[in-house]
């Protein structure tokens, strides 16, 4: 065991248990948890005579450390006298000493409640030149108390003559005031009112709170997720406005397109936050084709209290494209958790950073809440990577031991998806570690003309030609999904194969 200094505790009797005619009384000092031996215990008995006896050290079974008790028996006018027990442990250091000063007996007492109150700000939320802190020490059995003010743990030189004590029934209350300059208060220091009473310490601390009034409104505009864009085929963008002060004025969020074309109907949501600020979101459905072709969307935020409108814009990310690589792993069985396994998926070297990660089980997409996926981080090269983690249960892998991690990304060809299957028990599942590709999406052709529509751009289905389900699952000719283009004056489009 390594060197350990002792903890020291005074040992006293309850005053009510000492006979009033007792001519001598014994008190003690416990030194415990030290290593190695020895400790030296000495007593300061003031003007009284006393005899001391230090008991042999005992070993504490669990830790192998030692404990010892020193007893002091005094006679005479001991009732008003204070005694000090000094414990020295030279193995800790040559000058290691702990002093405990206490009286012969302890009275039953009600401890105080310590609470710091602070002076108010002015009406505009600004601090006055000086700030008053009031320490309320309340509800304790009358007796001597000492109040100390600390600044970041250091004792302050404070005039305590202003402290006033009042008694209500059998309990007493004391208050002490501390005046600080605005500069000290704003410096973010912590102020503590420390109360010593009956050998115990009670305290409360305070500091300047974080600004509750927002320093400024912020607005953010998101891009559609690749899942919404390429799979769900109903992309949306969201304008998020945060740190609004709740007030009578209305926040207006207006959408526009750089091309000047009309925008769809947006949905708006307001939420009051815990810090008292307001968050407003507006979600706008955008056309798949419009987004892919590079349309720019603008969100304009106006409010009576804003000096000028906030403008945010978003468009498809430019720059080089790279498809993601997907690797899926199952962690080995961990002792004590035989009925759970963690699956991990590394998706890397993709550009741009917009990516959606999905997990599938039993050929069904699992909820996003089931997995935890990191934000895209830059690789050492020019691409990005994410990790995704899915916890699975025995019931799931016994139902079907194949889980699929899928990345949806614009550069993934031909279907904007790359996926990898993984099994908890690969040997039993018939080796599913190989890459699994989704069936290719087939381009959308016109039912009335040959070749590809120009808008398809060679690799993207016509945005309003919704993928049917194919085969017997969809009305229409076998192996062919028919869907009608909604725009006027254009021929209907059909899929020339399975989705």
């Amino acid at each position: 065991a390594s060197t350990q200094s002792p903890s020291v505790f005074p040992l006293t009797r309850c005053c009510k248990n000492i006979p009033s005619n007792a001519t001598s009384v014994t008190l003690g000092c416990l030194a415990t948890g030290y290593f190695p031996e020895p400790v030296m215990v000495t007593w300061d008995t003031g003007s009284l005579n006393g005899t001391t006896m230090t008991l042999p050290a005992t070993t504490l079974t669990l830790s192998g450390h030692y404990a010892t008790i020193s007893l002091l028996t005094v006679s005479g006018a001991w009732a008003k006298q204070m005694f000090t027990c000094r414990v020295a442990h030279t193995p800790s250091s040559t000058d290691w000493v702990d002093n405990k000063t206490f009286s012969v007996c302890s009275r039953d007492f009600t401890p105080p409640t310590v609470k710091i109150l602070q002076s108010s700000c002015d009406g505009g939320g600004h601090f006055p030149p000086t700030i008053q802190l009031l320490c309320l020490v309340s509800g304790y059995t009358p007796g001597t108390i000492n109040i100390t003010w600390l600044e970041d743990g250091q004792v302050m030189d404070v005039d305590l003559s202003t402290a006033s004590t009042t008694q209500e029934g059998e309990l007493a209350s004391t208050q002490s005031e501390l005046t600080l300059s605005q500069k000290h208060w704003l410096s973010d220091r912590t102020y503590t009112c420390q109360v010593t009473y009956q050998g115990h310490t009670f305290e409360d601390s305070t500091k300047k709170c974080a600004d509750s009034n927002p320093r400024g409104v912020s607005a953010y505009l998101s891009r559609p997720s690749p899942f919404d864009l390429f799979i769900r085929k109903s992309p949306t963008i969201t304008c998020l406005v945060v740190d609004l002060a709740p007030s009578k004025g209305t926040v207006n969020l207006t959408w526009s397109r750089a091309s000047g074309k009309p925008v769809n109907h947006s949905t708006r949501k307001e939420e009051k936050q815990r810090n008292g600020t307001l968050t407003v979101t507006s979600t706008l459905p955008v056309g798949t084709r419009d987004w892919i072709e590079g349309e720019t969307y603008q969100c304009r935020v106006t409010h009576p209290h804003l000096p000028r409108a906030l403008m945010r814009s978003t468009t498809k990310t430019s720059g080089p494209r790279a498809a993601p690589e997907v690797y899926a792993f199952a962690t080995p069985e961990w002792p004590g958790s035989r009925d759970k396994r963690t699956l991990a998926c590394l998706i890397q070297n993709f550009m741009p950073e917009d990516i959606s990660v999905q997990w599938l089980h039993n050929e069904v997409q699992l909820p996003d809440a089931r997995h935890s996926t990191t934000q895209p981080r830059k690789t050492k090269g020019s691409g990005f990577f994410v990790f995704s983690r899915l916890e699975v249960t025995r019931a799931e892998w016994e139902q079907k031991d194949e889980f699929i991690c899928r990345a949806v990304h614009e550069a993934a060809s031909p279907s904007q998806t790359v996926q990898r299957a993984v099994s908890v028990n690969p040997g039993l599942a018939g080796g599913s570690a190989q890459s699994q590709r989704a069936p290719d999406r087939v381009l959308c052709h016109s039912g009335q003309q040959q070749g590809l529509p120009r808008a398809a751009g060679g690799s993207v289905p016509h945005p309003r030609c919704h993928c049917g389900a194919g085969r017997a699952d969809w009305p229409g000719p076998p192996e062919l999904d028919v869907c009608v283009e909604e725009a006027e004056g254009e021929a209907p489009w059909t899929w020339t194969g399975l989705c």
Epitope: L360, E363, Q365, T417, A438, P439, A469, R471
Partner: nanobody, 118 residues
Framework: DVQLQESGGGLVQAGGSLRLSCAAS????????MSWYRQAPGKQRDMVAT???????AHADSVKGRFTISRDHAKNTVYLQMNSLKPEDTAVYYC?????????????WGQGTLVTVS
């Protein structure tokens, strides 16, 4: 784990109505393609109606105008409202969920609910 539970089947007279429910657990219905299939005794399983991720729906010619598929995101449930029922609609009705990238007939299935039209 992924589970589908159909309910709402029963015996009904011709011309009557029924509403089938398919309660999903372990996944979100609006993130997957949801379909109703039916299988009459001695026949193959046929698609009745499908609802895509974006909410688009399709119905087999034999039920168009009579059956309607819908979904409730909050209840994570898919419905099949069946009106003007005919004796030939008698079958076991199955709920199917599949990932949108998979071809039809794949995915997870419910146990089925029997609809008898007299």
């Amino acid at each position: 784990d992924v589970q589908l539970q159909e309910s709402g089947g029963g015996l009904v007279q011709a011309g009557g109505s029924l509403r089938l429910s398919c309660a999903a657990s372990g996944f979100i219905v609006s993130d997957n393609v949801m379909s109703w299939y039916r299988q009459a005794p001695g026949k193959q399983r046929d698609m009745v109606a499908t609802i895509m991720l974006n909410g688009d729906t399709a119905h087999a010619d034999s039920v168009k105008g009579r059956f309607t598929i819908s979904r409730d995101h909050a209840k994570n449930t898919v419905y099949l409202q069946m009106n003007s029922l005919k004796p030939e609609d008698t079958a076991v009705y199955y709920c199917n969920a599949r990932d949108s990238m998979l071809e039809p007939g794949r995915g997870a299935w419910g146990q089925g609910t029997l609809v008898t039209v007299s």
